[in-house]
Interface confidence: low
């Protein structure tokens, strides 16, 4: 019995269906096929869980959190024992193992390993201003999404015709900050932060209005 090499890892957006591949070759009839799918969750590597089991011609549920969401992709018994997981959750991220036995066929590699990463698009980021908006001050524009896997990067743009930030601005796309030094009237306007990762983008807008000092009445 020989389990085929798996592609290594599967990535899927949260809420979508993941298909975890596992196939094997055997010299024996599939009369005594036994398949166990296990997961080592990323969130708790010390606590392996059973996902689904096929034994004695019957399917059995694994851990409670997989109930109603998991099944074999094809009719069992078969040499393709791939499974699907519906409505994927963040907690489904982990290393999945399929363990295959088909007596009397012994020997060979009987384990396949596939990583599953559940991706989450950036949630709507928060745009904020730190610092005084008085003429000549330094301000920091902040942008941050609560959620996002992989971790989002942040791109700030000034929504004028050029999409360029003012010349006195420095941007940190990892932290989501823009520092604008010595703000002037030209710094005023609408700024957009675009939070993005491999599977999505989300934006927020911020209106920066530089306050000019009022002329003092004599």
């Amino acid at each position: 019995l020989e389990v085929s090499e798996s592609p290594g890892s599967v990535q899927v957006a949260r809420g979508q269906t993941a298909v975890l591949p596992c196939a094997f070759s055997t010299s024996a009839a599939l009369l005594n096929l036994n398949v166990i799918w296990m997961v080592i969750p990323l969130s708790n590597a010390n606590q392996p869980e059973q996902v689904i089991l096929y034994q004695g011609g019957q399917m059995f549920d694994g851990a409670l959190r997989f109930h109603g969401r998991v099944g074999f992709t094809g009719t069992m018994p078969a040499t393709n024992v791939s499974i699907f997981i519906n409505n994927t959750q963040l907690s489904d991220t982990g290393t999945y193992q399929c363990l295959v036995n088909n007596l009397p066929d012994r020997g060979g590699r009987n384990i396949g390993v596939t990583g599953l990463t559940v991706l989450v698009p950036p949630s709507a980021p928060q745009c904020q201003i730190q610092g005084s908006q008085d003429l000549g001050s330094d301000v920091i524009l902040l942008c941050s999404s609560e959620e996002g896997i992989p971790r989002p990067t942040y791109l700030w743009e000034k929504l004028d015709n050029t999409l360029k930030l003012p010349p006195t601005a420095t941007q940190d796309q990892v932290q989501g900050t823009v520092t604008i030094r010595n703000i002037s009237a030209l710094s005023s306007g609408l700024y957009q932060c675009v939070a993005s990762n491999a599977i999505g983008t989300s934006t927020c807008l911020l209106d920066l209005q530089v306050i000019s000092p009022q002329p003092r009445s004599v």
Epitope: E157, L159, D160, N161, T162, L163, L190, T203, L205, D207
Partner: antibody, heavy 121, light 108 residues
Framework: QVQLVESGGGVVQPGRSLRLSCAAS????????MHWVRQAPGKGLEWVAV????????YYADSVKGRFTISRDNSKNTLYLQMNSLRAEDTAVYYC??????????????WGQGTLVTVSS | ETTLTQSPGTLSLSPGERATLSCRAS???????LAWYQQKPGQAPRLLIY???SRATGIPDRFSGSGSGTDFTLTISRLEPEDFAVYYC?????????FGQGTKVEIK
């Protein structure tokens, strides 16, 4: 004077592709963001996509995301819309429009005359 | 996505009358980033108003825009024969930019 001339429209079968062009003249093309907007026969306007002055930023309507690609060649003063996996609901007159000088989100005064795309088997 | 609802669908008026067109947004339009366009049959749209109340270059002063947040209005103080057309509002405060379904101003 400012001129925008669309071309590339026609009749195409569902699932096929088409590329629209918009030739610009009378202004410094490389300084302006550009939009595509469409209008189904007898219907209202629907914004399709926008591209920044240098092509580094692009945004799409959800209805075309993943199927349409906006691009530009500033050396040729030309805006493009590559439309793949066309559907019957993509049937419309497609307009290119120049952003206003002060706000790249405002479509501005200048629009092409439109080119008709008909998706039909 | 911000949905814009225009009312009425059709406005039947005579030349010289005042036209009031309404545009209501499903959520607040950031910084009054709202535009109005005019479209005549067989023609491309023409920008009238941007920023809710700023008239575009060359637009007669009988066209005015007002409003903020979710409620916006286009007013044509005295209708001229060339003003009979379809009018669209559009928000550009958040992506995707969206248009209203249009109001047709027709001759009574």
């Amino acid at each position: 004077q400012v001129q925008l001339v669309e071309s590339g429209g026609g009749v195409v079968q569902p699932g096929r592709s088409l590329r629209l062009s918009c030739a610009a003249s009378g202004f410094t093309f490389s300084s302006y963001a550009m939009h595509w907007v469409r209008q189904a026969p007898g219907k209202g306007l629907e914004w399709v996509a926008v591209i920044s002055y240098d092509g580094s930023n692009k945004y799409y309507a959800d209805s075309v995301k993943g199927r349409f690609t906006i691009s530009r060649d500033n050396s040729k003063n030309t805006l493009y819309l590559q439309m793949n996996s066309l559907r019957a609901e993509d049937t419309a007159v497609y307009y290119c429009a120049r952003a206003s000088p002060s706000q790249w989100l405002v479509l501005g005064h200048y629009w092409g005359q439109g080119t008709l795309v008909t998706v039909s088997s | 996505e911000t949905t814009l609802t225009q009312s009425p669908g059709t406005l039947s008026l005579s030349p010289g009358e005042r036209a009031t067109l309404s545009c209501r947004a499903s959520q607040s339009v950031s910084s009054s980033y709202l535009a109005w366009y005019q479209q005549k049959p067989g023609q491309a749209p023409r920008l009238l108003i941007y920023g809710a109340s700023s008239r575009a270059t060359g637009i007669p002063d009988r066209f005015s825009g007002s409003g903020s947040g979710t409620d916006f209005t286009l007013t044509i103080s005295r209708l001229e024969p060339e003003d009979f057309a379809v009018y669209y509002c559009q928000q550009y405060g958040s992506s995707p930019w969206t248009f209203g379904q249009g109001t047709k101003v027709e001759i009574k």
